[in-house]
């Protein structure tokens, strides 16, 4: 008799999930010498242990602590780039400005980026059919809890000037319900972080509005100021040109020396 399986509203675990995590871990540790000491099999065992045989709506940050410990990584705390709803551009930026780090440039973020996973209560099986949706099913699911945990730790580690890339094409440029708005903003440490600098990325070619005056940006400024952190905001009107100039600042159309 086939066992009854809970049907969740979200997509199931990414196919070849164990192999993908292990392969990503090996690749990352090979090209990042400071992480060469990491044993990828142990990382996978700790990752698996966080959600296998557990109810996928009852996952806690505690479940991920063994993985967090194995994936402990020091990044330059003054070179952190947070992002919200504009992941691709943030990643393109840290590819051309390699001294800056998004969460996905760290081992744990790299392992889980764009993947979905969940298990089932009391069985060692991975559920490839469906996983809980954050809105429709439950918020304490394996994926959401993972990102909440690593995002909190990443924000807590930040110092000096912290940068955040925001999507100026969205109706809510700053969204209180995003990971940035609900987790990272509240875990920046005022005793370490001097300024949060928002980069608002424009979508339209002819868009010359000052999106730093947007009500949601003012809301972000208010939240940050109340936490005794300074706030600054800059418009990036042409993201394509911006990336090009970051790569080659000596181009005559780009230069502004300090």
């Amino acid at each position: 008799v086939p066992r009854w399986r809970q049907q969740w509203s979200g997509p199931g675990t990414t196919k070849r999930f164990p192999e993908t995590v292990l392969a990503r871990c090996v690749k990352y540790t090979e090209i990042h010498p400071e992480m060469r000491h990491v044993d990828c099999q142990s990382v996978w065992d700790a990752f698996k242990g966080a959600f296998i045989s557990k109810h996928p709506c009852n996952i806690t940050e505690e479940d991920y602590q063994p993985l967090m410990k194995l994936g402990t990584q020091t990044v330059p705390c003054n070179k952190i780039l947070l992002w919200s709803r504009i992941k691709d551009l943030a990643h393109q930026f840290t590819q051309v400005q390699r001294d800056m780090f998004t969460l996905e440039d760290t081992l744990l973020g790299y392992l889980a980026d764009d993947l979905t996973w969940c298990g089932e209560f009391n069985t060692s099986k991975i559920n490839y059919q469906s996983c809980p949706d954050w809105r429709k099913d439950c918020s304490n699911n394996p994926v959401s809890v993972f990102w909440k945990t690593v995002s909190r730790r990443f924000a807590e580690a930040a110092c000096d000037v912290v940068h955040v890339m925001l999507n100026g094409s969205r109706s809510k440029i700053f969204d209180k319900n995003s990971t940035f708005g609900s987790v990272e903003v509240h875990n920046l440490q005022p005793e370490k972080v001097q300024t949060l600098e928002a980069w608002v990325i424009h979508g339209g070619r002819e868009d010359s509005r000052d999106l730093c005056q947007d009500p949601t940006i003012k809301e972000l400024e208010s939240i940050i100021s109340k936490r005794n952190i300074q706030f600054s905001c800059k418009n990036i009107y042409r993201p394509d040109k911006f990336l090009q100039c970051v790569k080659n600042p000596e181009d005559s159309s780009c230069t502004s020396e300090i």
Partner: antibody
Framework: EVQLLESGGGLVQPGGSLRLSCTGF????????MSWVRQAPGKGLEWVAD????????YYADSVKGRFTISRDNSANTLYVQMNSLRAEDTAVYYC????????????????????WGQGTTVTVSS | QSVLTQTPSVSGTPGQRVTISCSGI??????VSWYQQLPGTAPKLLIF???QRLSGVPDRFSGSGSGTSASLAISGLQSEDEADYYC???????????FGGGTKLTVL
Amino acid sequence: EVQLLESGGGLVQPGGSLRLSCTGFGFTFTDARMSWVRQAPGKGLEWVADISSYGDNTYYADSVKGRFTISRDNSANTLYVQMNSLRAEDTAVYYCAKRMEREVMTIKLDYHAMDVWGQGTTVTVSS
Amino acid sequence: QSVLTQTPSVSGTPGQRVTISCSGIFNIRNYVSWYQQLPGTAPKLLIFKDDQRLSGVPDRFSGSGSGTSASLAISGLQSEDEADYYCAAWDIFLNVWVFGGGTKLTVL
């Protein structure tokens, strides 16, 4: 013209002290991270120390840690290095250098290079 | 603190192309820069961010990098290129500058 001018070098006995100065011209000194680099006679370049634009972060080579102090006076556009407990192996030409930074569409970025160098000042430690 | 490794000397005739290598870069996120030091003068920046030429530097000078090594190529060698060349990298994890030992270029 962007320029750095060092001064303060000279002959000093082992165990003695010396303070070198470097004044910047032609750029916004307050915005610039600065470094000291030295070159012993007939040898290669050796980094000595680095300081952030407002002086709140300082970094040192192991060989000078605890003996040298890098500092700056932004109101005078001047960088300093205070050298104490000097040794014969500190004999070198000392250069100050500006860290390369650029503003790309109002965003300030560090390019991890030294784009302006002073002419150097000679320090000789000998009895 | 580690030192980057450079070939101590290279030579070439006018018009030739020479390459200077730099190895021992600890991390793929560290950028390499290249400096020219003419006899009796201060160093001068040629290349930053692995392969970006500083404005005013002739395009005969080019930099390249792949992971843990980098190189400086000089094509169409000229007598005035005779100098010492240094690679350097700022280690973003340790907050230290690391220099190569230098390469003496002789134009025969």
